[in-house]
């Protein structure tokens, strides 16, 4: 393990998973590293092996229990350490006292479906996955629609500042193929970030009726 510029970032999915990424410039690909979790008020310790995801980046998931079980609370602290093997010993490369509900990243929304589609509008719904009941309604969403001839990066973001698991897209073009994505973020947590984007939902608006104004 070379002393390059390193970064250790972890997020809690609010239920039973802590996902971590460790990056280090100049580190050898075959360096053996792991994340060790030591909670302050739980009986368990957990370790996961960091596996390469790119040239200088490794990731692993600390799976704390069944996907929908509430394994940590707002008062928990979990000390997370990156340990890398150097010869016969393990060296601490990074350490943080991790507060799960200050470092949230939820799972991507799932079960996207078209509820109703017309020539100029489309109503879409979705569900959140493995989200803690602690949030109650304190969630927000961002959505984006991919129009023909554009990229996802160009798509304007629609913000839903409340727990609203549906959207009505307006001013669409008739008989046109679109794609739609949504992501979610709890309002809680200094280091909380957006979930990954959902899988895109493809839909097509209805064609305009012949001989009528559109």
């Amino acid at each position: 393990a070379v002393n390059g510029t390193s970064q250790f970032t972890c997020f809690y999915n609010s239920r039973a998973n802590i996902s971590c990424v460790w990056s280090q410039d100049g580190a050898l690909q075959d360096t053996s590293c792991q994340v060790h979790a030591w909670p302050d008020r739980r009986r368990w310790n957990q370790t996961c092996e960091l596996l390469p995801v790119s040239q200088a980046s490794w990731a692993c998931n600390l799976i704390l229990g069944a996907p929908d079980s509430q394994k940590l609370t707002t008062v928990d602290i979990v000390t997370l350490r990156v340990l890398c093997r150097e010869g016969v010993r393990w060296r601490v490369m990074a350490i943080q006292d991790f507060k799960p509900f200050e470092n949230l990243r939820l799972m991507a929304p799932i079960s996207l479906q078209v509820v109703h589609v017309e020539t100029h509008r489309c109503n879409i719904s979705w569900e959140i996955s493995q989200a803690s009941h602690y949030f109650e309604r304190h969630l927000e969403f961002e959505a984006r629609t991919l129009s023909p001839g554009h990229t996802w990066e160009e798509a304007p973001l629609l913000t839903l500042k409340q727990k609203q698991e549906w959207i009505c897209l307006e001013t669409l073009t008739p008989d046109t193929q679109y794609e739609f994505q949504v992501r979610v973020k709890p309002l809680q947590g200094e280091f909380t970030t957006w979930s990954p984007w959902s899988q895109p939902l493809a839909f097509r608006t209805k064609p305009a009726a012949l001989g009528k104004d559109t």
Partner: nanobody
């Protein structure tokens, strides 16, 4: 904005003790790793000790290990450095420092220091 105010420095004889304090404000203190660094007369900044956000991990420079103890009181937003068995070579201005995240990197202990206070002077002399 981040404010770090050190106190507790002074003149002490070799073998004596001092306790430095650092009052922090302007950020969620318990969410950040903290450290003490020092600057001896005519020298550069030297890392002394670091502590994780909840105080569960502490690290020390070899030159102070066994003599200095870092601690924190998150209810009081205060960082401490207990200095025992002081030596003339400990003479320096001591700065309280905040890291840019909750993470501390032991192999590169000065990395990520984002803010520091005005410092408190410690003189060890007979």
């Amino acid at each position: 904005q981040v404010q770090l105010v050190e106190s507790g420095g002074g003149l002490v004889q070799p073998g004596g003790s001092l306790r430095l304090s650092c009052a922090a404000s302007g950020f969620t203190f318990s969410n950040y790793a903290m450290s003490w660094v020092r600057q001896a007369p005519g020298k550069g900044l030297e890392w002394v000790s670091s502590i994780t956000g909840a105080g569960r991990g502490t690290y020390y420079a070899e030159s102070v290990k066994g003599r200095f103890t870092i601690s924190r009181d998150n209810d009081k937003n205060t960082l401490y450095l207990q200095m025992n068995s002081l030596k003339p070579e400990d003479t320096a201005v001591y700065y309280c420092a905040k890291y840019d995240s909750s993470t501390f990197y032991p192999p590169t202990p000065a990395r990520g220091i984002a803010d520091r206070g005005q410092g408190t002077r410690v003189t060890v002399s007979s």
